[in-house]
């Protein structure tokens, strides 16, 4: 009679994470008598996966009834597969011995590859806000996928970006992989409503890529422009001066009126109007009693936006002139740093 052969008909098996892997194995003879064992890997460090004779292997089930006398099918099923299960599995026939069974013949091995989906991409931007015309970095990370081949793309408002660098780790063989990409994005004054999207395509996703997004509203700071104008007189001795604060984002803004350098009123932007591009406009007014001033008055609208150094604009109110409307004086903007006295 021909010597027993252990046949593993599948050189490789590909299974999606979470599913069940079937590893096929048949023997060509019932002799010699002895159990079958399954191992992952070869050599002294191999890992026992299933022992027909003894042990508890909750994830493993046999395809046929191994207790039947004439059974020669030693195929197994491994449930709830994870990337950690990847490797080469050997079906090994043992000959009954005393005191221990002796390894008789091994199958050629079946390589189990696990297809694992990448995790949802996580996109993160800079630690602090940046102003328009600056280039900032966004990172995208996704983990736990297998096989290693993966495609990552970046988009800003649907337009594909080209300035990015991507790494897949580790470089060598591994049960699963991670991807890390950094894209450079140029901010514009119109980017409050913009989105940066990281798109990951992988064989496990059946053509339906995963996307991670970041809203540029979390990243951008649009500085305001200021305009101080004098309105027509309300009464003989009263002049209305307005400060228009335009095109700013985010909304956090505090405005202070100063008369000849002395604080007159401080207020916080509340009832702002929103522009189409997501930036805000706000207007504050100051009623000045001209008769209370003997000399010309320097009115300053000082704005502190989103914790930045104060920006200001001044208007010279001529007291000597008859109180009629005067043109706006687009004097000073920008007081520099918070620690400085601008007057």
């Amino acid at each position: 009679e021909e010597e027993l052969q252990v046949i593993q008909p599948d050189k490789s098996v590909l299974v999606a994470a979470g599913e069940t892997a079937t590893l096929r194995c048949t023997a060509t003879s019932l002799i010699p008598v002895g159990p079958i064992q399954w191992f992952r890997g070869a050599g002294p460090g191999r890992e026992l996966i299933y022992n027909q004779k003894e042990g508890h292997f909750p994830r493993v089930t046999t395809v046929s009834d191994l207790t039947k006398r004439n059974n020669m099918d030693f195929s197994i099923r491994i449930g709830n597969i994870t990337p950690a299960d990847a490797g080469t599995y050997y079906c090994v026939k043992f000959r009954k011995g005393s005191p221990d069974d002796v390894e008789f013949k091994s199958g050629a091995g079946t390589e189990l590859s696990v297809r694992a989906k990448p995790s949802a991409p996580v996109v993160s931007g800079p630690a602090a806000r940046a102003t328009p015309q600056h280039t900032v970095s966004f990172t995208c990370e996704s983990h736990g996928f297998s096989p290693r081949d993966i495609t990552l793309k970046w988009f800003k408002n649907g337009n594909e970006l080209s300035d990015f660098q991507t790494n897949v780790d580790p470089v060598g063989e591994s049960v699963s992989y991670s991807i890390h990409s950094t894209a450079k994005v140029v901010l514009t004054r119109e980017d409050v409503h913009s989105q940066v999207i990281c798109e990951v395509a992988h064989v496990t996703l059946q053509g339906d890529p995963l996307r991670g997004t970041a809203n540029l509203s979390e990243t951008i700071r649009v500085p305001p422009t200021l305009e101080v104008t004098q309105q027509p007189v309300r009464a003989e001795n009263q002049v209305n001066v307005t400060c228009q604060v335009r095109k700013f984002y985010p909304q956090r803004l505090q405005l202070t009126w100063l008369e000849n350098g002395n604080v007159s009123r401080t207020e916080t932007a509340s009832t702002v109007t929103e522009n189409k591009d997501g930036t805000y406009n706000w207007m504050s007014w100051l009623l000045v009693n001209v008769s209370a001033h003997r000399d010309d008055v320097k009115l300053t609208c000082q704005v502190e936006h989103d914790g930045q150094p104060a920006v200001s604009k001044s208007h010279d109110l001529k007291v000597s002139a008859h109180p009629k409307e005067q043109g706006s004086n687009t004097a000073a903007e920008n007081t520099g740093s918070n620690e400085r006295n601008i007057y």
């Epitope: 600056h134 150094p309 740093s337």
Partner: antibody, heavy 119, light 107 residues
């Protein structure tokens, strides 16, 4: 008080790179941008670019076609400007300056670093 | 890039004279204009920002005005220590650009 202290003069050969440092003190380093401006002998001022140490955001003058790299080390409050592929026309005094983009002009300047490119 | 055309390139005036320098931008820069003074061998010094704001510690004889594309820098009464080169600069759009400079001398 606000101070920007730059590294010393450099002499480089054409094709080489130079890295100029600018150490900031007297203010919150991550709140302000550091800009780089150069001035060739007897010439005017030319803006090269800036970096915001807080956000890592940068803006560059495209004239330099990627030859300028700016980095910031928040642990030492130092900004570095590296200019590569040097040519003789890069001979200039290089200044680092402080500003708040969109809000404020360049209010404090370093003492300048003379970079001479000569074969 | 926004061009800043500064004129004149040089001027000579007497102590006490009123000196005016103009700067024309190639496009609207709102009021993001600064003026700097540079003395030989020294770094530039900020005098005026936001078109008309006087930097802290700068004498009140220096002033600025204008908006949009046309800007003016004035020294109301020229002093011997004002001998320097003056530059305008826009900081509305990158790349930030400077005027060519005006060298001011005493007659």
């Amino acid at each position: 008080q606000v101070q920007l202290v730059q590294s010393g003069a450099e002499v480089k050969k054409p094709g080489a790179s130079v890295k100029v440092s600018c150490k900031a003190s007297g203010y919150t380093f991550t709140d302000y941008e550091i800009h780089w401006v150069r001035q060739a002998p007897g010439q005017g001022l030319e803006w090269m670019g800036d970096i915001h140490p807080g956000s890592g955001g940068t803006a560059n003058n495209q004239k330099f076609k990627g030859r300028v790299t700016m980095t910031a080390d928040t642990s030492t409050s130092t900004v570095y400007m590296e200019l590569s592929s040097l040519r003789s026309e890069d001979t200039a005094v290089y200044y680092c300056t402080r500003a708040v983009s969109g809000y404020y002009a360049m209010d404090y300047w370093g003492q300048g670093t003379l970079v001479t490119v000569s074969s | 890039d926004i061009q800043m055309t500064q004129s004149p390139s040089s001027l000579s005036a007497s102590v006490g004279d009123r000196v005016t320098i103009t700067c024309k931008a190639s496009e609207d820069i709102y009021d993001r204009v600064a003026w700097y003074q540079q003395k030989p061998g020294k770094a530039p010094k900020l005098l005026i920002y936001g078109t008309a704001s006087l930097e802290t510690g700068v004498p009140s004889r220096f002033s600025g005005s204008g908006s949009g594309t046309d800007f003016t820098f004035t020294i109301s009464s020229l002093q011997p220590e004002d001998i320097a080169t003056y530059y305008c600069q826009q900081y509305w759009t990158t790349p930030w650009t400077f005027g060519g400079g005006t060298k001011v001398e005493i007659k």
